[in-house]
């Protein structure tokens, strides 16, 4: 259905009053042409008196015919005032004004609340030339009006440089009442009170509001929007909305679950990342947050070792990224591992433990007694040390890791080898006469390189020097020995 | 949001006149038309006119035809109401007020209170 | 012109009463579009009027729903539920349907 809005052409007007033509204008025209009641007002004025009217839908030409008579003023014809009409109704409107022959070119645009109206909108204008005098009527039409198309309507022409301007057309769009404010999910402390707020506007207004829990109404008297519901408390899951009622009828917001807090359940899937010696990287998929959000969670970790104490190792972090890494374990070590989260209301369980076992370590002590001599007749270094006290979880031991750096005149080299497990010696050239050699030693396993022995100082002087009594590791208190016979 | 400010109060002799401005803003000014009312102490309130700003238009309560004049400046946003030959009976307080989308005068201004006294 | 006529002059009511106002028209403020453009006011001391509802039986914006008209054609009626304090004031009707525009002469809430 098309509200459709014409022109006056009774001498009362079609809307309210004299907004637009209910009464003749308070000047009448320059001339006296024939015209409906319904025109404009025309401001009266002296033909000869320059300058442009006062009222500015108004222009006066200042062409004058053949027989030099003045023409009449313009002004758009009165139209409608103001429709009133549901949402989704269309609606068409016009404005319309008689102008002589002798202007060409003359165009009409719509503006609403100030702003033109350009583009997607049904605007017509037509033409119905005459000996003297064109009509020109623009049509401005609405498909479906939305409650954003409430607003003041006119038309402007632009004519000689003057804008003539019509009166306006209001329209008022009504409908059933339109939500600003929907309740709004929530996840609450049992047994405790919460608010939830529902407004919704017309027109037409008032809105009323009636509330309904697990579709019963919850108020017997509605409230004028904008309500606000105080639950007291709830023990378990419940669905809210609310109904706004207008005169157009009733629109029903969306239903919002309010959910009871309560502790995590436990996270699930703990696995293992990566496993060194000393640390074991795990993830976890968090378990459902009973509805409030994890702050922190907590590692839990114990020896899997039946000879052990039993006693908990425990790690808090942050519930975020879900992934931890454990330090200070024990190498080649079996463990369990578990993992639990907490929110606002408390601890979830603990996940299903996961066993987990470190690596072998790196040695954690130095070959002992290191000792090194020249052999000069062989031109070697001789070096001695015994094995260190490996423990079981530092691994199998697999050899040593021999460092010599020789320093000489401002020159410096570092030399590294390797040698099998089974030894406690080794024999190493000499590189460089008249020279410092310093040694150091660490035992090596499949998990690494353990720490070097303290160093121990040779000199090895030019060719034809005396032999040697043996360099050996520095007893506590001596820093860096060199003993040179 | 609507606003409509009017200009302060106005102590006149008789036969001056005066001219009372009511600034507009919020709103298109130049899309929705502006009346005036005429409120007497103790007494009831008197529609005196309108203006369109758009187009200058008006239209008058024929009691008031020659008494007032109304005016729109849209550059300002502000309407005015000029009152001419005053006497006491022209002492009041004189408001203007907004036409809305409702077709009712929806935002009225503070009023502007006008003594004609010798 | 459209006379109103509004009764009564004052009315005393207690707070938490039910008040009525009564507005009558000497013409028929029903325009041809079916609409009736008749409109309530409340003015509290020293302020300007407010609207309270607009044709016949539309609350404004923020209205409390104490407040509720009704009428057709001549007759009109404004009644609020229950009076507060901040009610009282001196109410007035407006027709817009007829140029020139009339109010009511007004009535005053005030407490017994």
């Known amino acids: 259905a098309i509200t459709e809005a014409r022109e006056e052409a009774k001498p009362y007007p079609l809307f309210p009053g004299p907004f637009p033509g209910s009464l003749q204008t308070d000047h009448t025209p320059l001339l006296s042409l024939p015209h409906a009641s319904g025109y404009q007002p025309a401001l009266m004025f002296s033909p000869t008196q320059p300058g442009r009217p006062h009222t500015g839908n108004v222009a006066i030409p200042q062409v004058t015919s053949v027989e030099s008579k003045p023409l009449p003023p313009l002004a758009f014809k009165h139209t409608v005032g103001h429709i009133i009409l549901s949402e989704h109704k269309g609606v068409k409107f016009n404005c319309s004004i008689s102008v002589p022959n002798i202007y060409q070119d003359t165009t009409i645009s719509w503006w609403k609340d100030g702003k033109e109206l350009l583009g997607a909108h049904h605007a017509i204008t037509q033409f119905y030339p005459d000996d003297e005098v064109t009509a020109i009527i623009a049509s401005f039409s609405i498909t479906s009006v939305q409650r954003s198309d409430n607003g003041s309507y006119i038309c402007k022409m632009k004519i000689n440089n003057e804008e003539i301007v019509s009166d306006p057309i209001y329209i008022e769009v009504q409908g059933l009442p339109h939500f600003t404010k929907q309740p709004e999910s929530m996840n609450v402390t049992r047994n405790t009170a919460f608010n939830l707020t529902c407004q919704a506007v017309g027109p037409p207004e008032p809105v009323n509001i009636f509330w309904v829990q697990n579709s019963s109404r919850v108020n017997e008297q509605p409230e004028k929007s904008p309500s606000v519901l105080t639950v007291p408390g709830l023990t378990e899951m419940a669905v809210f909305s609310c109904e706004a009622h207008n005169d157009k009828g009733l629109t029903v917001s969306k239903g919002v679950q309010i959910n009871i807090k309560a502790i995590p359940s436990p996270p699930t899937e703990v696995s293992i990342r990566n496993s060194t010696a000393h640390s074991i990287l795990i993830s976890w998929v968090p378990g459902f947050d009973g509805y409030s959000p994890f702050r922190n969670c907590s590692i839990q970790v114990k020896e899997a070792d039946p000879l052990s104490n039993g006693s908990v190792m425990i790690f808090n972090t942050s519930a975020l990224p879900h992934l931890y890494q454990i330090k200070q374990l024990q190498a080649l070590a079996n463990y369990s591992i578990g993992v639990s989260c907490m929110n606002e209301i408390g601890w979830s369980a603990v996940s299903p433990w996961i066993l987990a076992s470190t690596t072998e370590g790196a040695p954690s002590v130095a070959p002992l007694n290191v000792t090194v001599f020249l052999n000069e007749s062989s031109d070697n270094v001789d070096i001695r040390w015994m094995k260190p006290p490996t423990k079981q979880q530092d691994g199998e031991l697999v050899g040593y890791r021999i460092s010599h750096v020789w320093q000489s005149a401002g020159i410096s080299k570092e030399l590294l080898e390797e040698v099998g497990q089974n030894g406690s010696r080794a024999r190493i050239s000499v590189q460089v006469h008249n020279a410092t050699c310093t040694v150091r030693i660490a035992a090596v396993t499949r998990g690494g390189v353990g720490p070097f022995s303290d160093p121990v100082k040779i000199f090895i002087p030019a060719h034809g020097w005396v032999d040697y009594a043996p360099s050996s590791t520095p007893a506590p208190g001596n820093a860096d020995p060199v003993l040179i016979i | 949001q609507v606003q409509l400010q009017q200009s302060g109060p106005e102590l006149v002799k008789p036969g001056t006149s005066v001219k009372i401005s009511c600034k507009a803003s919020?709103?298109?000014?130049?899309?929705?038309?502006i009346h005036w009312v005429k409120q007497r102490p103790g007494q009831g309130l008197d529609w005196i006119g309108w203006i369109f700003p758009g187009n200058r238009n008006t239209q008058y309560n024929e009691k008031f035809k020659g008494k007032a004049t109304l005016t729109a400046d849209t550059s300002s946003s502000t309407a005015y109401m000029q009152l001419s030959s005053l006497t006491s009976e022209d002492s009041a307080v004189y408001y203007c007020?907004?036409?809305?989308?409702?077709?009712?005068?929806?935002?009225w201004g503070q009023g502007t209170s006008v003594t004609v006294s010798s | 012109d459209a006379v109103m006529t509004q009764t009564p002059l004052s009315l005393p009511v207690s707070l938490g009463d039910q008040a009525s106002i009564s507005c009558r028209s000497s013409q028929s403020l029903e325009n041809s579009n079916g609409h009736t453009y008749l409109h309530w006011y409340l003015q509290k001391p020293g302020q300007s009027p407010q609207l309270l509802i607009y044709r016949v039986s539309n609350r404004f914006s923020g209205v409390q729903d104490r407040f509720s008209g009704s009428g057709s054609g001549t007759d009109f009626t404004l009644k609020i539920s229950r009076v507060e304090a901040e009610d009282l004031g001196v109410y007035f009707c407006?027709?817009?349907?007829?140029?020139?525009?009339?109010f009511g002469s007004g009535t005053k809430l005030e407490i017994k």
């Open positions: 007020a907004r036409l809305g989308l409702i077709y009712a005068l929806d935002y």
């Open positions: 407006l027709q817009v349907t007829h140029v020139p525009f009339t």
């Open positions: 919020g709103y298109s000014f130049t899309s929705y038309y």
